[in-house]
């Protein structure tokens, strides 16, 4: 009786159990009594990444620079496209489709955690004791500097954005 | 339903070529399948000549050496055997058959 | 080439018995997939072979449960459970596994 339902690695059609391509492969025709599925390898800049009866492999990804993106890892015929951003860039999905210029951390907020071509900066309010007045993507919160030790005075104090400002002891003191 | 039908001449002469058409309906031989010509010596014995496959490359039996040509007209879903140099040897019932389904067959006598 | 060596040339059986047919490959017929391509035919009496079993063990379609195949490798059997008037002509084995494809020599199923 003809099956229902087939092994792995197979599939049914015209009640018979038909062997699939293998990754990197399409499917040119279907298996019969007398003969085996016949398939084909992708031809350049295709690929198909499963077991798979797909009569057309698919195109490797473009990784296209006028949106910022480049080659991470060339696609083989069993496998797509990585792409990635360029420097000082990043991609504005896991698909990275496309990118975005790192963001930069304002004055008052410095780089938690630095950008890469997945993932933005990530900035931090400067807590007290620390500042940044620079906008950068790069640059932590710095701390105030310490006037105690360099034997001077807080003249004024620091915010998250300006340091302290140091100045001698009065001496009349 | 699948259906194939043989036709060509009855009697060939010895050093003539023997030429045959399959005629198919109910499938089109470039969809799939191995499209096969295949004789039956008197006494019953039955021989594999060759092929053409669904996308028109051929495979044939050595021992009919370089006499045989399989070809097809897909416009009219046929496809054809060419023997040439035949020989009384050669006298046989030719079927053409996708194996699962099969011609009626016809006779085919090689005299002078 | 591959031999196909059928046995018996001839079978006589009584209507309603169970008939067994042999067909032996010279080298093994199951290919690099694992699949065998050795196939069964009924030749009736002034008719073209029609397929009985395909891959050694499937029944082709309308094919009555009376007849079931087995074997593997270089070793085949074709049985028919209960034997009635309308099984009566020539059977034949066939592999396609290796070109060229080849027939056994036949079994003559007739009535003792």
């Known amino acids: 009786e003809p099956p229902t339902a087939c092994r792995e690695k197979q599939y049914l059609i015209n009640s018979q159990c038909c062997s699939l391509c293998q990754p990197g492969q399409k499917l040119v025709s279907d298996c019969t009594e007398f003969t085996e599925t016949e398939c084909l390898p992708c031809g350049e800049s295709e690929f198909l990444d499963t077991w798979n009866r797909e009569t057309h492999c698919h195109q490797h990804k473009y990784c296209d620079p006028n949106l910022g993106l480049r080659v991470q890892q060339k696609g083989t015929s069993e496998t797509d496209t990585i792409c990635t951003c360029e420097e000082g860039w990043h991609c504005t999905s896991e698909a990275c489709e496309s990118c975005v210029l790192h963001r930069s951390c304002s004055p008052g907020f410095g780089v938690k955690q630095i950008a890469t071509g997945v993932s933005d900066t990530i900035c931090e309010p400067c807590p007290v004791g620390f500042f940044s007045n620079v906008s950068s993507a790069f640059e932590k919160c710095h701390p105030w500097t310490s006037c105690e030790t360099k034997d001077l005075v807080v003249q004024q104090a620091g915010t998250n954005k300006t340091d302290v400002v140091c100045g001698p002891q009065d001496r009349l003191r | 339903e699948v259906q194939l039908q043989e036709s060509g001449p009855g009697l060939v002469k010895p050093s003539q070529s023997l030429s045959l058409t399959c005629s198919v309906t109910g499938y089109s031989i470039t969809t799939n399948y191995y499209w096969n010509w295949i004789r039956q010596f008197p006494g019953n014995k039955l021989e594999w000549m060759g092929y053409i496959k669904y996308d028109g490359s051929n495979n044939y039996n050595p021992s009919l050496k370089n006499r045989i040509s399989i070809t097809r007209d897909t416009s009219k879903n046929q496809f054809f055997l060419k023997l040439n140099s035949v020989t009384t040897e050669d006298t046989a019932t030719y079927y053409c058959?996708?194996?699962?389904?099969w011609g009626q067959g016809t006779s085919v006598t090689v005299s002078s | 080439d591959i031999v196909l060596t059928q046995s018996p040339l001839s079978l006589p059986v009584s209507l309603g018995d169970q008939a067994s047919i042999s067909c032996r490959s010279s080298?093994?017929?199951?290919?690099?997939?694992?699949?065998?391509?050795l196939n069964w035919f009924l030749q009736k009496p002034g008719q073209s072979p029609q397929l009985l079993i395909y891959k050694v063990s499937n029944r082709f379609s309308g094919v009555l449960d009376r007849f079931s195949g087995t074997g593997s490798g270089t070793d085949f059997t074709l049985t028919i459970s209960r034997v009635e008037a309308e099984d009566l002509g020539v059977y034949f084995c066939l592999q396609v596994t290796h070109v060229p494809f080849t027939f056994g020599s036949g079994t003559k199923l007739e009535i003792k």
């Open positions: 080298q093994s017929l199951e290919n690099s997939n694992g699949n065998t391509f």
């Open positions: 058959a996708r194996l699962d389904y």
